[in-house]
Interface confidence: low
Amino acid sequence: VPDKTVRWCAVSEHEATKCQSFRDHMKSVIPSDGPSVACVKKASYLDCIRAIAANEADAVTLDAGLVYDAYLAPNNLKPVVAEFYGSKEDPQTFYYAVAVVKKDSGFQMNQLRGKKSCHTGLGRSAGWNIPIGLLYCDLPEPRKPLEKAVANFFSGSCAPCADGTDFPQLCQLCPGCGCSTLNQYFGYSGAFKCLKDGAGDVAFVKHSTIFENLANKADRDQYELLCLDNTRKPVDEYKDCHLAQVPSHTVVARSMGGKEDLIWELLNQAQEHFGKDKSKEFQLFSSPHGKDLLFKDSAHGFLKVPPRMDAKMYLGYEYVTAIRNLREGTCPEAPTDECKPVKWCALSHHERLKCDEWSVNSVGKIECVSAETTEDCIAKIMNGEADAMSLDGGFVYIAGKCGLVPVLAENYNKSDNCEDTPEAGYFAIAVVKKSASDLTWDNLKGKKSCHTAVGRTAGWNIPMGLLYNKINHCRFDEFFSEGCAPGSKKDSSLCKLCMGSGLNLCEPNNKEGYYGYTGAFRCLVEKGDVAFVKHQTVPQNTGGKNPDPWAKNLNEKDYELLCLDGTRKPVEEYANCHLARAPNHAVVTRKDKEACVHKILRQQQHLFGSNVTDCSGNFCLFRSETKDLLFRDDTVCLAKLHDRNTYEKYLGEEYVKAVGNLRKCSTSSLLEACTFRRP
């Protein structure tokens, strides 16, 4: 019988008492085979974290800063359940730390030196740790003691709870630096009042502060937010302009064998029986003998944290950066106006080889980071382990949902001003053998299909989106008799045709021979009935243009396209016989790296782009013997996006809508995790 006990960690006598009450009340409402509570008492949260890591306890609820500690080795804990606030209809699990300024003040985030600052209190998250952590590397040296460095950075501050004797500048705007509401500039509302009264130039608070203090929109319009990309936005655009997105209060557990499903089941039942307004005899979100015991008193319920979400992703890049800066106190030696090397994310062995070669040729401008799947790469870019990669439109969508931005687009047509003119896109097509003359778009059921990979544009999102509209279900593996769609579940019929050996079978990388455009076409040539690829794939792999043994004798005339009206056309007539127009592949990065990635990639393509005439002796960025490594092999240049600089604008409304519809069928654990942070 599996042990269905969750050992909750309590950090005080009062918490232990509430825990015992929690245990007893849960026993009375849960069947004997359901989850149960046991209580473990420790002296501090850090002791609880260590106890959970050592398998002496299973769960504890922590503030964001402690979630960071819990995640660090050797603890390796992960968030499993989040408290939420507000209503069930619009649950808030995060708050946003923001920098508020008056509208007419005219400076940006990178011009805060010498300004006057208002803080909620020394050592508090939104008011101190996050802004000072993010500004840490701009502070004058020596940066220790931190209070002195901050005092020397701003021309005056109000930082309640600071030592006014040792650091008088931190109390200049609020004499005495009182650490309670007796100080009119203490806390969220106090820091905002400090700005409102004109004492300070910037207030570091949370996103709701301005709404709680100014009910009138006209009054709120006198203020703006400073964004990390050195722009400003209106105060209601905090989701796109904040210093960090911070989880409020989170249950953590072990990453391996952490009972996360059991913890969720326990807490979900607990909130059913003892949540807000549920029971008189025991209340989960109430602390008669103290405040915020086990859970925050202000919480309204729990939400399950998606399993793909580790602590780094949950806390977010900005928050982790701020806290790490404060804790580790290390800053890069390079001056901040100079770009650090761009860490390119390479998929599997083949891309890594090409990336390493690029790195050597770039003389240190490019570094390489490896991952096994595109989603793993996106996650690494999110958390700062990597900086950039070029993605198919389907993954640009996921990356965008995860907060990344497109920075340059691959262009596939030669033109005089290639770098200035991003193209409208390429065509997604369905290719069949000419000899299979009875095959049409309308009778694909039961046939063998070849896809570039699950989640990619031409190979999956467009054809499966069209198919979904027709069949109204997600059982694509039943619609086709078998196929190869790398990234499918290994036991799926859509892995049956794949050719990868052992663990590489059906993997969404080049270790699977039928991966990508060329791989999907090869799958058609050797085993399949239909391949979903781009309009250039057939000409690029026929007529001797691909020297590989399977391709060298192929003739374009032996293949035809399926049109949506049930007819067929020759391959060269793709403009009148395609499934949809697909957005070109694009390079994505984090917002904070956008300018540097743009600058370095433009330098790199001038050195190694399509102007290099001899790729047999020189490194060519856009060549890899039809394997599309790092970039598509038919890339002519990387083009500026101009105003199409968000994933929605880049992909276009129609494609975003199509992928949105297909999300019903999505198996992307990363997309699930990212929509938890930003629904």
Partner: nanobody, 128 residues
Framework: EVQLVESGGGSVQAGGSLRLSCRAS????????MGWFRQAPGKEREGVAV????????YYADSVKGRFTISEDNAKNTVYLQMDSLKLEDTAMYYC?????????????????????WGQGTQVTVSS
Amino acid sequence: EVQLVESGGGSVQAGGSLRLSCRASGHAYGGNYMGWFRQAPGKEREGVAVLYTGGGSTYYADSVKGRFTISEDNAKNTVYLQMDSLKLEDTAMYYCALALGSARWYTSSLDARAYNIWGQGTQVTVSS
């Protein structure tokens, strides 16, 4: 495609019993919320009884506690609702529902919005 097929509805006298069945197909059974909702004419759809499949917990609306019992047969991917001591006010269309994926993020397992797969419904009529 995930499908839910209900059976077992019908007409019964007040105080009598009925047993509803709901079979799920097209997905890996276990680790999801599945259960019964009902909608009487002119009223909103309400949660009746739900369980966490694969041997998990059960949840009941206050109005049916002690009278209705939800259970499952893992091997058959089927959830049952045993309805005893039926009352006139139990008359409604009864729907089987399953919450897959992110639907589980809702706070209450008896909240209809948490469910993204629904059966066609089976009518239960209780007369005096």
